[in-house]
């Protein structure tokens, strides 16, 4: 139950991180202007991976693509890049861990096809939640460098006079959503990866077989349940270990004294 | 340089109804409306993109005033309605070439008077 939960609540959580970064990725609002020093401004710029758009006052806003494909910094082409694997992964790894749900019927899949399809999303998830997370950090780095160097410039401007001209970028609302999806891809991922333990048929599991004892003199013998040897002398006994076992209908037994107690 | 020709504004009766024209020499990237009341500021009526269409209404005249084009004529049209006496004011027609906002329009047309009173 526990495991169906855990689970259950890791593709939830991921589903949203996922949902969280295409939200994050096709936002416009990756870097706004910074208004520290000029709250009252005619014209709000902001800009996105895709495009930059401009707000006046009187609330219209016109974006622009970016309809270049090399003229762009090489930076801003890594964190498309970081972005859409990381969507693609999501994806990938949302459309695997549907079928490896446990509260899913699919033909007769064993439990060890499901928990190798559950660790198989949660790797996904976790690499989608890290593409996301550095894809956001590499452009928040770049933000911040940025920032620094304009607010640099200001200051010291052709012959030392101050220029206010220049327009500084600050994170934008993108950023903190992609951090946040990012994050929950992750936790989900984790999550999956947990429930796969739980959904793994150990190794050493027995399957529990009843014995009759198949003669009138013939008692039960003690014995360990050893995966190679058989049980007592009867060497007709399968070996009780995995498939090899039968159950206690399959087992064949003989009327004995035993049996009519 | 293109020209911008204005036409349609008048005095007109609360709750009535005008149809502002603009007729540009060429065709545009953008064309709207901006108006100036008396002792106010440049206010950013509406705009259509020409080539898609896309446009744009200020919140105090939504659902009460419509932009329409017509690019085989260059025109664009500024259906007003349910008039009240806050939209008194000289209607301004206005062009970019390669943007909408007000800082990149370059033509300007002569402007025309819209009254709205009893």
């Known amino acids: 139950m526990a495991v169906t939960a855990c689970q259950g609540l890791g593709f939830v959580v991921s589903l949203i991180g996922i949902a969280g970064i295409i939200a994050a990725t096709c936002m416009d609002q990756w870097s706004t202007q910074d208004l520290y020093n000029n709250p009252v401004t005619a014209v709000f710029n902001y800009q996105g991976l895709w495009r930059s758009c401009v707000r006046e006052s009187s609330g219209f806003t016109e974006c622009r693509g970016y309809f270049t494909l090399l003229g762009l910094p090489a930076m801003l082409q890594a964190v498309r890049a970081l972005m859409i694997v990381g969507i693609v992964l999501g994806a990938i790894g949302l459309l695997v861990s549907i079928f490896a749900l446990k509260c899913i019927r699919i033909g007769s899949m064993e439990d060890s096809a499901k928990a190798n399809m559950t660790l198989t999303s949660g790797i996904m998830f976790i690499v989608s939640g890290l593409c996301a997370i550095a894809g956001v950090s590499v452009f928040a780095n770049m933000l911040v460098t940025n920032f620094w160097m304009s607010t640099a410039n200001m200051y010291t401007g052709m012959g030392g006079m101050v220029q206010t001209v220049q327009t500084r970028y600050t994170f934008g609302a993108a950023l903190f959503v992609g951090w946040v999806a990012g994050g929950l891809t992750l936790i989900g991922g984790v999550m999956m990866c947990i429930a796969c333990r739980g959904l793994a048929p150990e190794e050493t599991n027995y399957k529990a077989v009843s014995y009759h004892a198949s003669g009138h003199s013939v008692a039960y013998k003690p014995g360990g349940f050893k995966a190679s040897t058989g049980f007592g002398s009867n060497t007709k006994n399968k070996k009780i270990y995995d498939g090899g076992a039968r159950t206690e209908d399959e087992v064949q037994s003989y009327p004995s004294k035993h049996d009519y107690v | 340089q293109v020209q911008l020709l204005e036409s349609g504004g008048g005095l007109v009766q609360p709750g009535g109804s005008l149809r502002l024209s603009c007729a540009a020499s060429?065709?545009?990237?953008?064309m709207g409306w901006f108006r100036q009341a008396p002792g106010k500021g440049l206010e950013r009526v509406a705009n259509v993109y020409m080539r898609n269409g896309d446009t744009w209404l200020a919140d105090s005249v939504k659902g009460r005033f419509t932009i329409s084009r017509d690019n085989s004529k260059n025109a664009v049209y500024l259906q007003m309605t349910r008039l009240r006496a806050e939209d008194t004011a000289v209607y301004y027609c206005a062009a970019g070439r390669s943007s909408c906002l007000e800082a990149s329009i370059s033509y300007w047309g002569q402007g025309t008077l819209v009254t709205v009173s009893s």
């Open positions: 060429r065709s545009t990237y953008c």
